[in-house]
Amino acid sequence: MAVTACQGLGFVVSLIGIAGIIAATCMDQWSTQDLYNNPVTAVFNYQGLWRSCVRESSGFTECRGYFTLLGLPAMLQAVRALMIVGIVLGAIGLLVSIFALKCIRIGSMEDSAKANMTLTSGIMFIVSGLCAIAGVSVFANMLVTNFWMSTANMYTGMGGMVQTVQTRYTFGAALFVGWVAGGLTLIGGVMMCIACRGLAPEETNYKAVSYHASGHSVAYKPGGFKASTGFGSNTKNKKIYDGGARTEDEVQSYPSKHDYV
């Protein structure tokens, strides 16, 4: 019961986590610029992995997608890749874990198969969570370093002058969503791995044969039959259950000091 609960909870936690990773990846608020007063009105800038937005105090909002793939910083591309890998792994993990759930019966799937699938999905969730946490952390590091905004400078560009305005970008809501979601996915994955240990069958899958001490003149033949030694009268090869070789499926064997395994 505890195993089923652990597995189910792990699945739900991972599901919430992956939904959060997807939400964070799609959100526009990865970096935000604090409200500043310009000659017109308060303008609020914020950016995501895919587009940049401006919102005015009047409520007007405009977003534009990043114009080129090649012109984007390598770090931004890396963050995108990490988040997408996290989503893909998480989605596959969810698919695998659905079939691995103990409460769901699919054909004659053995517990060992469910255990393996639970472990697989658990590992996928862990990697997915780590990808999301890494992606968000790399982006956060980009914001902290502020490498492009160290000084406000003016220079002459094509067709006029360009001035870089000193600005400070802060962590957007998406970063916190990503960190929390990544953490939840990671925790869910760990729970699935723990559940896997409980699902794995204690006994081995093959039929173990225990050899019990019997009469001094008894020879063993596979299949649990006593062979006649000339003294007995078992000429019809009747199966004998009182001390010969027995499979564990045939009889419950109670240990004694004479048992050899």
């Epitope: 990865w30 970096s31 610029q33 310009n38 017109v40 009105t41 303008v43 800038n45 914020y46 950016q47 940049s52 937005c53 401006v54 005015e56 009047s58 409520g59 007007f60 405009e62 977003c63 534009r64 990043y66 114009f67 080129t68 012109g71 984007l72 910083p73 931004l76 982006f139 980009m142 914001l143 492009w148 905004m149 560009g157 006029g160 002058m161 360009v162 001035q163 870089t164 305005v165 600005t167 970008y169």
Partner: nanobody, 121 residues
Framework: QVQLAESGGGLVQPGGSLRLSCAAS????????MGWYRQAPGKERELVAT???????NYQGDLKGRFIISGDNTKDTVYLQMNNLQPEDTAVYYC???????????????WGQGTQVTVSS
């Protein structure tokens, strides 16, 4: 790279009108606001008018009645309709865009090369 192309300047008699236009092209992301500045001979560059993408306008004190700023968001173009021009309006008029590139390059102010407006009889 962002380019600003201004047009519409010229010589006009006092009381006359002119319409300046400025189109931005290139890799433009979030435009915070666009507008016009002017610099008269021997003077500092001063704000004429600005407009946000949402249409909020701002004018330099006494210009509001005579000058009208407007923008076309689809074309990334800003216009300045100047009516009842006076000799003191003679200056080089510079188109202005403030564009936010965020993580791609911060906040940048762009000025055009300027277009000469001369008010003389």
């Amino acid at each position: 790279q962002v380019q600003l192309a201004e047009s519409g300047g010229g010589l006009v008699q006092p009381g006359g009108s002119l319409r300046l236009s400025c189109a931005a092209s290139g890799n433009i992301l979030s435009i915070n606001y666009m507008g016009w500045y002017r610099q008269a001979p021997g003077k500092e560059r001063e704000l004429v008018a600005t407009i946000t993408r949402g249409g909020t306008t701002n004018y330099q004190g006494d210009l509001k009645g005579r000058f009208i700023i407007s923008g076309d968001n689809t074309k990334d173009t800003v216009y300045l309709q100047m009516n009842n021009l006076q000799p003191e309006d003679t200056a080089v008029y510079y188109c202005y865009f403030r564009i936010n590139f965020g993580i791609l390059g911060g906040l940048r102010d762009y000025w055009g090369q300027g277009t000469q407006v001369t008010v003389s009889s």
